[in-house]
């Protein structure tokens, strides 16, 4: 007989799990960089752009050695989940201005969807503990301008594209410890 | 220009340590991973590891894990990778490479520096 | 770690004549819609120069005559007619897990 009703169910090979989570990660962070080149060819911005409401970096070099796989997955999930918010804001917020980047920005948006459902699976397949349902963000700010836009576009691909590098080193740094 | 330019030549004794160093220039440096990649004679290229600018963070193949150190140095854009404990084995060109986030394929190469190690 | 074998190790053919490359992995490389494969091109006293990357994308500056294709464990550089600046040494490289490794290499010589 399986698990009982509710539990989770414990995966026989959580290194493959991972493995699988990684190679999705890399998809996504090949996606981006893509879709980053896109922008900065039709969209050039100079200089780093920052964007207040998205997730600040989640680790240094340093804090990456004592990382946790229950700590990885939870700040991973809840970035991703920041930005999925953010790529759904963009293309909400600046349809017409951005529209050379579709489906570019669908695609992107459909994979970052499926890796966090593919962290939530993880989660529950390594029988951690589940995080109670985020509370409502506050509503993201229109652009005050289409450049305002732009810029912000530049922002969010940037910060995902780093958070997506750091995401495959961790999680491939925990493989080794499993 | 994107550019990748090494420190020269080496010679060293067994035992002894080697520092290389890799200035990058024509690109933000912080947007990319720096590699490092082996080229002994008469053998297969071969991956050291890679170091993210922005958070540190090397990776290591494991073959080398103990013996190579990766560090950057942002404000100078430069790489650098020692290799301790060094044995006649090691003598090769060393190469830092320009690789895309999380990736491991290498655009942009340094001119290589060549190590010897020779008692 | 994957292994990658190169063949031939070594190919003989005039300028104008079309070269086929051929790099074998010892497991998938291929997942989550790309394929973890790229080729370069070393010259003797250079370093390698990235051609193709991700199994089939010509990388910038890269003349269009350098195509790559396959999937799974089977891949192909293709040089569609050769130049006398293509003779050289290829090498294939994988980045499907860590660590990435190489192939052996062909040698690209002029008959």
């Known amino acids: 007989p399986g698990p009982p009703p509710g539990s989770p169910r414990a995966s026989p090979d959580p290194r493959a799990e991972l493995d699988s989570t990684v190679l999705l990660t890399r998809s996504l962070l090949e996606d981006t960089r893509q879709l980053t080149i896109q922008l900065k060819d039709k969209f050039p911005a100079d200089g780093d752009h920052n964007l207040d409401s998205l997730p600040t970096l989640a680790m240094s070099a340093g804090a990456l050695g004592a990382l946790q796989l229950p700590s990885v997955l939870t700040r991973l999930r809840a970035d991703l989940l920041s930005y999925l918010r953010h790529v759904q804001w963009l293309r909400r917020a600046m349809g017409s201005s951005l529209k050379t980047l579709e489906p570019e920005l669908g695609t992107l948006q459909t994979r970052l969807d499926r890796l966090l459902r593919r962290l939530q699976l993880l989660m529950s397949r390594l029988a951690l503990p589940q995080l109670p349902p985020d509370p409502p963000a506050p509503p993201l700010a229109p652009p005050s301008s289409t450049w305002g836009g732009i810029r912000a576009a530049h922002a969010i691909l940037g910060g995902l594209h780093l958070t997506l590098d750091w995401a495959v080193r961790g999680l491939l740094l925990l493989k080794t410890r499993l | 220009e994107v550019q990748l330019v090494q420190s020269g030549a080496e010679v060293k004794k067994p035992g002894a340590s080697v520092k290389i160093s890799c200035k990058a220039s024509?690109?933000?440096?912080?947007?990319?991973?720096m590699d490092w990649v082996k080229q002994a004679p008469g053998q297969r290229l071969e991956w050291i590891g890679d170091?993210?600018?922005?958070?540190?963070?090397?990776i290591y193949n494991q073959k080398f894990t103990g013996r190579a150190t990766l560090t950057v140095d942002k404000s100078a854009s430069t790489a650098y990778m020692e290799l301790s404990s060094l044995r006649s084995e090691d003598t090769a060109v060393y190469y830092c490479?320009?690789?895309?986030?999380?990736?491991?394929?290498?655009?942009?190469w340094g001119q290589g520096t060549t190590v010897t190690v020779s008692s | 770690d994957i292994v990658l074998t190169q063949s031939p190790a070594s190919l003989a053919l005039s300028p104008g004549e079309r070269a086929t490359l051929s790099c074998r992995a010892s497991?998938?490389?291929?997942?989550?819609?790309?394929?973890?494969i790229h080729w370069y091109q070393q010259k003797p006293g250079q370093a390698p120069r990235l051609l193709i990357y991700?199994?089939?994308n010509l990388e910038s500056g890269v003349p269009a005559r350098f195509s790559g294709s396959g999937s799974g464990t089977d891949f192909t550089l293709t040089i569609s007619s050769l130049e006398e600046e293509d003779f050289a040494t290829y090498y294939c490289?994988?980045?499907?897990?860590?660590?990435?490794?190489f192939g052996q290499g062909t040698k690209l010589e002029i008959k």
């Open positions: 170091i993210n600018p922005t958070i540190g963070a090397p």
């Open positions: 490289q994988h980045s499907r897990d860590l660590p990435p490794t």
């Open positions: 024509g690109y933000t440096f912080t947007d990319y991973n």
């Open positions: 991700l199994a089939s």
């Open positions: 490479a320009r690789g895309a986030l999380a990736h491991w394929y290498f655009d942009v």
């Open positions: 497991k998938s490389v291929s997942t989550e819609g790309y394929s973890y």
